[in-house]
């Protein structure tokens, strides 16, 4: 009878084991072991027992002891079970950002590991077990589906293998994959709200505000604001689940035309964009042209108003005929026209909005001098010793210089309060002089003597 010891062995892959083959007869003709494993016989006294060192055991094996005794041949097997932990424990790659509400499939792949009957695959969120399954197939694959929630943000998902050899008197061997950190996000289906001027004048500044509610995590949202090809640098303020991005836009003549204003919000692997059209226009104030800004009375004056080619103008309230960017009027300058304002109003339609610009010019009419009865009476009669103020106003542009003299020497104190005396009586020659010429007028002062009764 042949026997083997031990009859069952569990050993690490690549390990060695001592196997004793024994026989019940004293003088066996033959005693040995049959195995593909490298073996080394250890010398022992006696003929009915042999000890072999079997080395580099890579896989499960069943070495067989045999003996040949007078009463016949017999065999006995020992069962070598090799254990080893998996060579690869990996979670299938996933995008790090996942939208809330999406079903996320976690897939763990396990390569190697034995004995498979003792090998379990566990999928975890943090330390919480999501799924536990025996390792089946090569590679073994275990999957589970997770409904992504907001509170999963930042959670670590991993896969662990457990090789449980405790029933065999060994320990529990664990291998864990690299963790997958989940970043969850919510980007609403509504596009961002964009507030900006619809029209903007060249060489001015405007403010653009882009905002969106219902974002998570709001601090991770990227905001891109652009006007045409110009990147805008917004100042972003964050709320609990909202942001507001404010940018100042300066436009120059280079920007004239229709530009696309875009606000793009990028969160996770998704984006939302809002597009708006901004018309940048150049509209200088209309030009009011006078033939000459200063003319003499009686001169023909042409007043022209010229504006942007697409504008419509009115000159002193009168629309251009035909309606367009130019208007003019003709007049013969009168003293009443001195200081008269000629106002040109231009209206330009830009993207459905009416823009108004005004320009005013003043006409100076040179005339005079004038001395008339109303402003310079020809006769004054005053009681002697009374207080009087002689008045004589000369008109003209430029304002004339006025002198009233009696006998070419004695002045009448125009505009001054005087005590009427006999000396004041007489005829004065009032002379008004300016660059436009000279006029004279006679003024008589009569002094009434008091009656003595």
């Amino acid at each position: 009878q042949t026997s083997v010891s031990p009859s069952k062995v569990i050993l690490p892959r690549g390990g060695s084991v001592l196997v004793t083959c024994s026989t019940s007869c004293d003088q066996p003709k033959l005693l040995g072991i049959e195995t593909p494993l490298p073996k080394k016989e250890l010398l022992l006294p006696g003929n009915n027992r042999k000890v072999y060192e079997l080395s580099n055991v890579q896989e499960d094996s069943q070495p067989m002891c045999y003996s040949n005794c007078p009463d016949g041949q017999s065999t006995a097997k020992t069962f070598l079970t090799v254990y080893w932990t998996p060579e690869r424990v990996e979670l299938a790659p996933l995008p790090s950002w996942q939208p809330v509400g999406k079903n996320l499939t976690l897939r763990c792949q396990v390569e190697g590991g034995a004995p498979r009957a003792n090998l379990t695959v566990v999928l975890l969120r943090g330390e919480k077990e999501l799924k536990r399954e025996p390792a089946v197939g090569e590679p073994a694959e275990v999957t589970t589906t997770v409904l992504v929630r907001r509170d999963h943000h930042g959670a670590n998902f991993s896969c662990r293998t457990e090789l449980d050899l405790r029933p065999q008197g060994l320990e529990l061997f664990e291998n864990t994959s690299a963790p997958y950190q989940l970043q969850t996000f919510v980007l609403p289906a509504t596009p961002p709200q964009l507030v900006s001027p619809r029209v903007l004048e060249v060489d001015t500044q405007g403010t653009v505000v882009c905002s969106l509610d219902g974002l998570f995590p709001v601090s991770e949202a990227q905001v891109h604001l652009a006007l045409g090809d110009q990147r805008l640098n917004p100042t972003v303020t964050y709320g609990n689940d909202s942001f507001s991005a404010k940018a100042s836009v300066s436009v120059t003549a280079e920007d004239e035309g229709t530009q696309r204003l875009t606000c793009a919000v990028i969160l996770g692997n998704q984006s939302q964009e809002t597009l708006q059209t901004v018309t940048i226009y150049s509209f200088p104030a209309p030009n009011v042209i006078l033939t000459k800004p200063e003319v003499s009375e009686g001169t023909e004056v042409t007043v022209k108003c010229e504006a942007h080619p697409r504008a419509k103008v009115t000159l002193n309230g009168v629309p251009a005929q035909p309606l367009g960017p130019r208007a003019q009027l003709l007049l013969k300058a009168t003293p009443e026209d001195n200081g008269r304002s000629f106002s040109c109003s231009a209206t330009l339609e830009v993207a459905g909005q009416l823009i108004h610009k005004n320009q005013t010019r003043e006409l100076r009419v040179l005339y005079g001098p004038r001395l008339d009865e109303r402003d310079c009476p020809g006769n004054w009669t005053w009681p002697e010793n009374s207080q009087q103020t002689p008045m004589c106003q000369a008109w003209g542009n430029p304002l004339p210089e006025l002198k009233c003299l009696k006998d070419g020497t004695f002045p009448l104190p125009i505009g001054e309060s005087v005590t009427v005396t006999r000396d004041l009586e007489g005829t004065y020659l009032c002379r008004a002089r300016s660059t436009q010429g000279e006029v004279t007028r006679k003024v008589t002062v009569n002094v009434l003597s008091p009656r003595y009764e």
Partner: antibody, heavy 119, light 110 residues
């Protein structure tokens, strides 16, 4: 559809003058800025000049400033480039292109017209 | 400086992805636009703004930018994509209105 057709190119003597035209159709001409871009044979693209939709603003590359004049006639939907004091290095295909705003990218291009300056 | 720098030549195997880059100071302020020019033809706009395509341009063309570099990516290059590609931007130095890169000759290897 948008069409831009350049004309007026040809052989011109060194120091001579030439006027290029670009006839536009298929879009509101006065609402678009227009540009001239040139390409010397076998070489890259070079921006030459641009004009705003209203014609009120004009821009020139340093290499042509003082010699070339860009203009437009919105009533005729036509862009012009008056070239004078022409040099050998002005030899190129001249393309007209439109953009939604003066400094903007070029949405559409013409097929080009060749200007050859000979000595 | 008002220069935009491009690699003179790039090649790609048919169906593979290729990235053409453009560098310049103005790209920190302005987005680049990209033009395709086939031999003997006028340039055609393929990308503008941050990453916008005009109608009729296949979605294998995309644009991106970072710092002073703009990139044009062709995902799954086709034989008909063999052409010269030019980047173009507004000139932040103020000397010119717009500037072009020197161009990149793209060869599609069959």
């Amino acid at each position: 559809q948008v069409q831009l057709q350049e004309s007026g190119g040809g052989l011109v003597q060194l120091g001579g003058s030439l006027r290029l035209s670009c006839a536009a159709s298929g879009f509101t001409f006065s609402s678009y800025a227009m540009s001239w871009v040139r390409q010397a044979p076998g070489k890259g693209l070079e921006w030459v000049s641009a004009i705003s939709g209203s014609g009120g603003s004009t821009y020139y590359a340093d290499s042509v400033k003082g010699r070339f004049t860009i203009s437009r006639d919105n009533s005729k939907n036509t862009l012009y480039l008056q070239m004078s004091s022409l040099r050998a290095e002005d030899t190129a295909f001249y393309y007209c292109a439109n953009s939604a705003y003066t400094g903007g990218w070029y949405d559409y291009w013409g097929h080009g017209t060749l200007v050859t300056v000979s000595s | 400086s008002s220069e935009l720098t491009q690699d003179p030549a790039v090649s790609v195997a048919l169906g593979q992805t290729v990235k053409i880059t453009c560098q310049g100071d103005s790209l920190r302020t302005y987005y680049a636009s990209w033009y395709q020019q086939r031999p003997g033809q006028a340039p055609v706009l393929v990308i503008y703004g941050e990453n916008s395509r005009p109608s009729g341009i296949p979605d294998r063309f995309s644009g991106s930018s970072s710092g002073n570099t703009a990139s044009l990516t062709i995902t799954g290059a086709q034989a008909e994509d063999e052409a010269d590609y030019y980047c173009n931007s507004r000139d932040s130095s103020g000397n010119h209105l717009r500037v072009f890169g020197g161009g990149t000759k793209l060869t599609v290897l069959r």
